[in-house]
């Protein structure tokens, strides 16, 4: 059996204020350093303890950073992306994509573009419960006749 991982993808705008030691995180990725196969995007590899990002709490390791101060991070060399952050100023606005893993199920694979990453048990359990309640009510009704 192959494992299946479903992801819930959300986007968020995160505004950070540069602290005494900077923004406080590391990145990987870029056109010359693909971190995710077939994706040259920029990903957060490390959040530094007590840094601006850690104290803010919203940016997470594994997040994909889509833009910095409105500037797209697509098709950038790794060092160019690093330089963009270093020159971003005191107040830095990040457009971030979070990928939340919601289930490790049995087989199949859901493409990234498919937004319906809801675990099947979340649908089946309520349906099963409703069926049981309906069956019980029907039996009680028959007994009263």
């Amino acid at each position: 059996m192959n494992g299946r991982v479903d992801y819930l993808v959300t986007e968020e705008e995160i505004n950070l204020t540069r602290g005494p030691s900077g923004l406080g995180f590391n990145i990987v990725g870029g056109t010359d350093q693909q971190y995710v196969s077939n994706d040259s995007g920029i990903y957060v590899s490390r959040i530094k303890e007590n840094g601006a990002a850690a104290l803010d709490g919203r940016l997470q390791e594994g997040d994909k950073i889509l833009s910095v101060n409105g500037q797209d991070l697509k098709n950038l060399l790794h060092q160019d992306a690093v330089d963009l952050f270093r020159n971003a100023g005191y107040a830095v606005s990040l457009r971030v994509q979070h990928r939340l893993q919601v289930q490790n199920g049995p087989i199949g694979h859901r493409g990234e573009g498919d937004p319906s990453g809801i675990p099947i048990f979340m649908v089946l359990v309520p349906v099963f419960a409703l069926t049981m309640v309906a069956a019980w009510a029907f039996m009680r009704y028959r007994q009263q006749l």
Epitope: L23, I27, V28, F85
Partner: nanobody
Framework: HVQLVESGGGLVQPGGSVRVSCVSS????????IGWFRQAPGKEREGVSC???????YYVDSVKGRFTISRDNAKNTVYLQMNSLKPEDTAVYYC???????????????????YWDQGTQVTVS
């Protein structure tokens, strides 16, 4: 479990050469910055050389032209070749690893590193 193990070093004559190696286990080097740092008796730990996650090398001014950093990702090893050694190069040399590139500073900044080895003594005398 991330681990760095250093080898090499020892006693060298002024003008001599030595190579120190840093082998990583528990992770692959490809996406890591690796730095070499040293601490002389009574002094603060200082950056010597580093190689970032895309292979760009950096050196502190005092070792430029004498020290060479290199990495062999297949062997999960980073090397520091030290030539034309001077008595002031005497110190405990440490290697350190950091996942990715800091958006705040170059890899010569020791505050950005998460993983450190136990250090190896280099004495130039």
């Amino acid at each position: 479990h991330v681990q760095l193990v250093e080898s090499g070093g020892g006693l060298v004559q002024p003008g001599g050469s030595v190579r120190v190696s840093c082998v990583s286990s528990g992770f692959i080097l490809d996406y890591y910055a690796i730095g070499w740092f040293r601490q002389a008796p009574g002094k603060e730990r200082e950056g010597v050389s580093c190689i970032d996650s895309v292979g760009r090398a950096y050196y502190v001014d005092s070792v430029k032209g004498r020290f060479t950093i290199s990495r062999d990702n297949a062997k999960n090893t980073v090397y520091l070749q030290m030539n034309s050694l001077k008595p002031e190069d005497t110190a405990v040399y440490y290697c350190a690893a950091d996942f990715g590139s800091s958006v705040d500073s170059t890899c010569l900044n020791n505050q950005q590193y998460d993983y450190w080895d136990q250090g190896t003594q280099v004495t130039v005398s």
